[in-house]
Structure formats: C-alpha cells, structure tokens
C-alpha cells in the first residue's frame, strides 16, 4: 500500500530573466527512493538516480542546475517556461509518487501591473 505523500514548493509566479527552485519532498513512507525524474509536460528535464547521480537533458543544460537536494534550479526564465512541472519519485517497494508545481513566468510589464506580491 502506498502511504507516502509528496509536498512541493507550491506554485510559483516569477519574473522573466529570474531564477527559481523547484522542490518536492516525499514523506510518510519508509520506501527507498531509487530515482527522481523532473518533467515539464512530456519533456524530461532531469533525472537524479540514487546510484548514478544527476543527468540533465541536453536541451536544458544551459538553464537547469541540479539541486538543492533532489530539487531543480531553473535559470534565465522565459515566458515559455510557464507551465506545469512534475517531480516523479520512483520508490521501492511503493512504486511511483508524483508532485505537481505550476510555474508562471511574467513579462516585466505584466509583473509590474498591479503587483503587490514579492516576486522571486
């Protein structure tokens, strides 16, 4: 039975050109994490394998950095980075747990319009 739960950083609104950290944390299970995949839509961004370490997809190498921890740092954000990101925890013996984070990247002009939020 899968008893674990995934906690995420929560959704994030950021400004074009900035950088943000996406993080997930698996709790309430003793299952062993064998691999964590980070995906956006149907694209694989990065893999953190318990034995082999990190692999960043070539198309994201310039703007994606591993960590902190099992998280992912996205740099030089563009409006095209807006979308849903998934942290997919492969565990034994539980199976797969998935967390969802939505990242909204705003043009500076939009970010300033009526903005009273702190932008990362």
């Amino acid at each position: 039975m899968m008893t674990g739960t995934i906690e995420t950083t929560g959704n994030i609104s950021a400004e074009k050109g900035g950088s943000i950290i996406l993080q997930c944390h698996l709790s309430s299970t003793t299952a062993q994490v064998t691999q964590v995949n980070w995906e956006q839509q149907d694209q694989l961004l990065a893999i953190c394998n318990a034995d082999l370490g990190w692999h960043i997809s070539p198309s994201f190498k310039d703007r994606v950095a591993p960590g902190p921890g099992l998280g992912l740092t996205l740099q030089s954000l563009t409006v095209n980075d807006t979308g849903e990101y998934f942290c997919i925890y492969h565990t034994y013996p539980d199976g797969t747990y998935t967390g969802r984070i939505f990242l909204e990247v705003l043009e500076s002009s939009v970010a300033e319009h009526g903005a009273r939020f702190q932008i990362p």
Epitope: G10, N11, S13, Q41, V79, E104, V110, G114, A115, F117
Partner: antibody, heavy 117, light 112 residues
Framework: EVQLQQSGPELVKPGASMKISCKAS????????MNWVKQSHGKNLEWIGL????????SYNQKFKGKATLTVDKSSSTAYMELLSLTSEDSAVYYC??????????WGQGTTLTVSS | DVVVTQTPLSLPVSFGDQVSISCRSS???????????LSWYLHKPGQSPQLLIY???NRFSGVPDRFSGSGSGTDFTLKISTIKPEDLGMYYC?????????FGGGTKLEIK
C-alpha cells in the same frame, strides 16, 4: 478594457461532445494563462484546468482528465474547451477566467450546458 | 488535493453591519518563497464571479475599501465593514498555491 466573450448556451444529447469558445480582447492574449471553471447546481465552483496560450501547455484537474480538452487559437485570441462523452452530470455553467498570480482577475459571462435526451 | 473549508455557509445580515467570512485550508498556503496565493470572489445572481481580494489582502482594482482580507498559513478572513445592497451574493475563497486550485464551498450573504 479586458473582455472574455463566451459562446452561447447549448442543449446536447447524452454521449455527444461539444466545444465552448472564449474570445479574449483588451490585453495580450499570450501573456496570461486561461482557466476553465465549472459551476454545478448554482453553487459549487470547480477548477477544470488551464492552458498557457504562449506555448500550448496545459494543466488539468485529475477529475476532468479525459472529460475536458483545452486548446487555443492564438491568431484569434480564442480559448476553447471541448467536453467529451457528455452525461447529465456535465450539465452546468462553464466559465473561462484569465489568471494572474494564481487569482482569476477577469471572467467570461458563462456558458450554460444542458445535457438531456 | 487541498481542502478549503468556508464558514459560515449562510450569513444573514442587515445593511450597515460588519461581517467576517472564514476560510481554512487543509495545509499551509505559503509557498517556498513565502508567497500565499489566496483570493476572494463575489458571485452575484445572473453575473460572473468577480475578484475582490488577491494575495490574502490586496484589493483588486475598483474594489471598495470596505472589503479587507487577512490571515496566514491555513487561516484566512474576509471582512466587509459596512454591508451595502450590492454586496449580497455568494462569496468564495480560492487557494492557488497547490495544484489543483480549489475553491471554498461558498458563503451566502443575504438579508435577515
């Protein structure tokens, strides 16, 4: 002035599919995500999903995966929601709503869908 | 999914009253940057919902200052200082911090 103009009311038969449109004006269509919200029985509001007009990316409430399909036509600044395999449970008012920082700042006027044989 | 509980379900008022509506979430609505995406809406009969408050306490453009929002973590409140006829309708809170966004069940503001 920001405006979201939705298509008119629909009466459809069970098992059919239908598409609701939401035409945006008064702002840069690709600069904001577009959400869809269901209101059943004149009360409960449920988030169906959203689409990112700039890149076509989508995010769905798991409850509506397979029921709703979201698309956009950037050239006409129009968002669409197709509802599939309709049943009486799908009878509701559907709204499109623009979002900024995860709040829905402008809403369409709503489209009433009635599913009945 | 994050469960959002609104109280009361119904709020009978007289014009001029001050009222509070509560919104509680099943987990904290602060993201890792300390930003909380909690908004409030008024839905009047025959109209579309309208945004009143975003980011806990920021009034949307054109919203009168008799509306105010407060709270943090899992507990949030909408206050209306002097009820006017145009304030009657259904009030909803919405959490946008966690996927999927979820609405409270609504509070009906009606005349006693």
């Amino acid at each position: 002035e920001v405006q979201l103009q939705q298509s008119g009311p629909e009466l459809v038969k069970p098992g059919a599919s239908m598409k609701i449109s939401c035409k945006a004006s008064g702002y840069s269509f690709t600069g904001y995500t577009m959400n869809w919200v269901k209101q059943s029985h004149g009360k409960n509001l449920e988030w169906i999903g959203l689409i990112v007009p700039s890149n076509g990316g989508t995010s769905y409430n798991q409850k509506f995966k397979g029921k709703a399909t979201l698309t956009v036509d950037k050239s006409s600044s129009t968002a669409y929601m197709e509802l599939l395999s309709l049943t009486s449970e799908d009878s509701a008012v559907y709204y499109c709503a623009r979002s900024l920082r995860f709040s829905f700042d402008y809403w369409g006027q709503g489209t009433t869908l009635t599913v009945s044989s | 999914d994050v469960v959002v509980t609104q109280t009361p379900l119904s709020l009978p008022v007289s014009f001029g009253d001050q009222v509070s509506i509560s919104c509680r979430s099943s987990q904290s609505l602060a993201n890792s940057y300390g930003t909380t995406y909690l908004s409030w809406y008024l839905h009047k009969p025959g109209q579309s919902p309208q945004l009143l408050i975003y980011g806990i306490s920021n009034r949307f453009s054109g919203v009168p200052d008799r509306f105010s929002g407060s709270g943090s973590g899992t507990d949030f409140t909408l206050k209306i200082s002097t009820i006017k006829p145009e304030d009657l309708g259904m009030y909803y809170c919405l959490q946008g911090t966690h996927q999927p966004p979820t609405f409270g069940g609504g509070t009906k503001l009606e005349i006693k």
